[in-house]
Interface confidence: low
């Protein structure tokens, strides 16, 4: 709030801009007829130092010269980089109640001379772009510093443009606004940057370049792909490029991929044949360009072209499995199952499957197409049957996969031994086995098959299976494995014309069942009691039930109950006990046990045997 220095003046020696570490002398002088009174000796001049509008020091003790009542000179040292404000005030000593009156002020800037600009780099984006250069300015000067960019080329032509740096903006890039055209391709250009401020000036080393050095081509545009004869693996990528481009880099990848396929193409002229594409796959394509084989810079990548390759006929072999069920003495039901091809094998949208069942000797053939991944037929029990399935898309069909229909569990000598199922974690089970001991024929492969042991699972849900080579004796099953569910697991050993199997139950995680079995009836037959029950509902089993326990005790007894443990079998829902006394009333109940523990007890039933005691 200095009122245009009406009372006096403030001057700085050597200058209001000084190098870091220098001292300055600040003189404050009153104008004639200005002051406190007619007694000059009562005029006291003081100097206040402000940084960022905050008073930081009264320089009363730094006076180096004093003309009493008229002027004072103060020496200031150790000024920090940047701007410092000094304000001179008049303090009338005979009037203590009045505050000092501002006389005038001055700003002193402390900084450094500019360093020579370094690392000059120039680019022209596209053949029709303009030249823009950037550089490293070096240390901050803390002063307003002007930069001049100067370009000299052929025909004695020089152009220049300026910008400045201060505490609000930085100047380390300039667009000259001129275009270097391809007809100047062989010419050399020299560029330099000069920096000037109040403390000095400096100039960069000259930087020499040619058109090819600095022109970064525009990214290719109008990218499209033409699939030759609607091929899914071969296509011609086409694009538009600037006229001088001699080298292109292509990158492409399926959309779900994490690594690019890279190709360099010389003199492609906006066209390149790709031969290794995956049919029926969403791809992303990008192209970059360069104007010179050895020198110059690559353009930015083009915008992505995203497109899907056409279909091709499926490849690969379907994984087939089957179930056999005898219907009566001369008919059997064959249910064929197969797994969908993975996308790289399907190579398109699978429209249907061609299924064939053939009786080898009589040459009877049943054929059908289905859109499902299973097929069921009733066929005679006699004869040797073989099945084949192939997958078809709009371009053709895969080679048929054949499987011989044998009695899967018909040959005891082929049954694998010591089958075990161990839970590995929440969603898989490790199945291990030993090979059949006395197989008549060599095992061609093992099939591990599993199905949730829930009501109707055989009819409602297809089986899950894994094919295992004959020299492997273990399988980690994980497909559709959920915790707290019991699975029936079968290991089949298959030879050319026979099959043997062993079965086990397993779960990936278990808890004690939620409830015990419900006793539905107690009947007395031939001096034995038969306990009948209903199984625990499937969701409450919480894993594979290992056994049931039947407990009993006399009605009012406080003694520990007796118990009978029964190996769990799905088909069994009654069991005899024979150690109860006649004409004694007993209380009976049941529990179920998994590997995790025992369930709470089921319902209690009272019963008084009438028969003779054992």
């Amino acid at each position: 709030n200095i009122d245009v220095c009406k009372l006096g003046t403030v001057t700085v020696q050597p200058a209001p801009v000084i190098p870091l570490g220098s001292a300055a002398n600040i003189s404050c002088s009153l104008n004639p007829k200005q002051g406190c009174s007619h007694y000059p000796s009562s005029n006291e001049l003081i100097l206040l130092k402000f940084v960022n509008d905050v008073l930081v020091e009264n320089l009363h003790g730094k006076k180096v010269h004093d003309h009493t009542g008229h002027s004072s000179t103060f020496q200031v040292t150790n000024l920090s980089l940047g701007m410092t404000l000094f304000v001179c005030k008049l303090n009338c000593s005979n009037s203590q109640k009045k505050p000092p009156v501002p006389v005038c002020g001055v700003e002193i800037s402390v900084g450094v001379a500019p360093e020579p600009p370094q690392n000059i780099s120039c680019v022209q984006e596209g053949e029709n772009g303009t030249v823009a250069c950037s550089w490293n300015s070096g240390k901050v000067t803390y002063l307003k510093t002007n930069y001049t960019l100067q370009l000299s080329g052929p025909n004695n032509l020089t152009c220049q443009k300026q910008c400045f740096s201060d505490n609000r903006q930085n100047c380390n890039r300039l667009d000259l606004g001129i275009n270097l055209s391809p007809d100047l391709a062989e010419s050399r250009f020299i560029v330099r940057v000069t920096a000037i401020n109040d403390l000095g000036n400096s100039s960069s080393l000259p930087h020499t370049f040619t058109f090819l050095d600095i022109v970064i081509p525009l990214p290719p545009w109008d990218i499209r792909i033409n699939f030759l004869n609607a091929s899914g693996s071969r296509g011609t990528l086409q694009w538009e490029d600037e006229g001088q481009v001699v080298l292109n880099q292509l990158r492409y990848q399926p959309l779900n991929s994490t690594s690019w396929n890279m190709v360099n193409a010389t003199n492609a002229k906006g066209k390149y044949d790709l031969r290794d594409l995956r049919p029926f796959t969403e791809y992303e394509f990008q192209i970059s360009s360069k104007l010179h084989l050895s020198g110059g810079s690559w353009s930015n990548w083009s915008e992505s072209l995203r497109t899907r390759t056409p279909e091709e006929e499926p490849v690969g072999i379907l994984d087939i499995w089957y179930m056999k069920q005898d219907i009566d003495y001369d008919r059997q039901q064959i249910s064929l199952f197969w797994k969908s091809l993975n996308p790289s094998e399907a190579r398109g949208k699978i429209l249907h499957y061609q299924v064939t069942l053939q009786e080898v000797t009589k040459k009877t053939t049943l054929q059908n197409t289905t859109r499902h991944t299973s097929w069921t037929r009733v066929i005679p029990r006699t004869g040797a049957w073989t099945a084949s399935v192939s997958a078809a898309n709009s371009k053709g069909a895969s080679a048929p996969t054949h499987i011989n229909i044998v009695d899967l569990c018909g040959t005891g000598l082929l049954a694998p031994h010591q089958v075990s199922a161990k839970s590995e974690n929440m969603d898989n089970i490790l199945v291990t086995w030993q090979p059949p001991k006395k197989a008549d024929s060599a095992v061609r492969e093992y099939i591990v098959e599993w199905r949730a042991l829930q009501p109707g699972s055989i009819t409602k849900f297809p089986p899950h299976w894994l094919r295992i080579p004959p020299d492997n004796m273990s399988a980690l099953i994980s497909e559709n494995i959920k915790p707290y569910i019991c699975y029936e697991i079968r290991v089949h050993a298959l030879s050319e014309s026979q099959g043997g199997c062993s079965s086990i139950r397993g779960d990936s995680k278990h808890k004690a069942p939620v409830s015990g079995p419900h006793i539905t009836a107690i009947t007395e037959k031939k001096e034995r009691l038969f306990i009948s029950w209903t199984h625990i509902p499937f969701p409450e089993q919480r894993g594979c039930i290992l056994h049931y326990r039947i407990y009993w005790k006399e009605r009012d007894s406080t003694a520990q109950p007796e118990l009978c443990e029964i190996q769990y079998r799905r088909s069994q829902n009654s069991h005899p006990i024979s150690s109860l006394q006649p004409r004694v009333t007993y209380v009976l109940w049941m529990t179920a046990v998994t590997a995790a523990g025992e369930s709470p007890q089921g319902n209690e039933r009272e019963f008084c045997p009438q028969g003779k005691a054992n």
Epitope: R224, E282, L305
Partner: nanobody, 129 residues
Framework: QVQLQESGGGLVQAGGSLRLSCAAS????????MAWFRQAPGTEREFVAG?????????FYDNSVMGRFTISRDSAKNTMWLQINNLKPEDTAVYYC?????????????????????WGQGTQVTVSS
């Protein structure tokens, strides 16, 4: 021999609707770019709407018709349609069906007449006020 045959044009009152059809014969264009262009008397043929032919079959429209025109096709029938609603007098023109023998994704190329290899004879649409 490849033929594109437009139909469905006619005289309609402003605010009315039309459904133009383009039936292709002699070649399957289901995977390739197709478009509708129009030409009013004394003006150049201009792009109206197009289908890219790439996976997902992207539709393109000129801003002047966006929201009123809908382009679609049935690959199995080798037919393309242009549903025109809320017709205006400035929609009066001969409407041409065009087909390419390649996929086109870039907006600029879809609009270009040179992108398309085959053209129909056109169907007249007249909108009276």
């Amino acid at each position: 021999q490849v033929q594109l045959q437009e139909s469905g044009g006619g005289l309609v009152q402003a605010g009315g609707s039309l459904r133009l059809s383009c039936a292709a014969s002699g070649r399957t264009f289901s995977n390739y770019a197709m478009a509708w262009f129009r030409q009013a008397p004394g003006t150049e043929r201009e792009f109206v709407a197009g289908l890219s032919g790439s996976g997902g079959d992207t539709a393109f429209y000129d801003n002047s018709v966006m929201g009123r025109f809908t382009i679609s096709r049935d690959s199995a029938k080798n037919t393309m349609w242009l549903q025109i609603n809320n017709l205006k007098p400035e929609d009066t023109a001969v409407y041409y069906c065009a087909a390419a023998t390649h996929v086109v994704v870039n907006y600029g190329l879809v609009r270009r007449r040179g992108t398309y290899d085959y053209w129909g004879q056109g169907t007249q649409v007249t909108v009276s006020s």
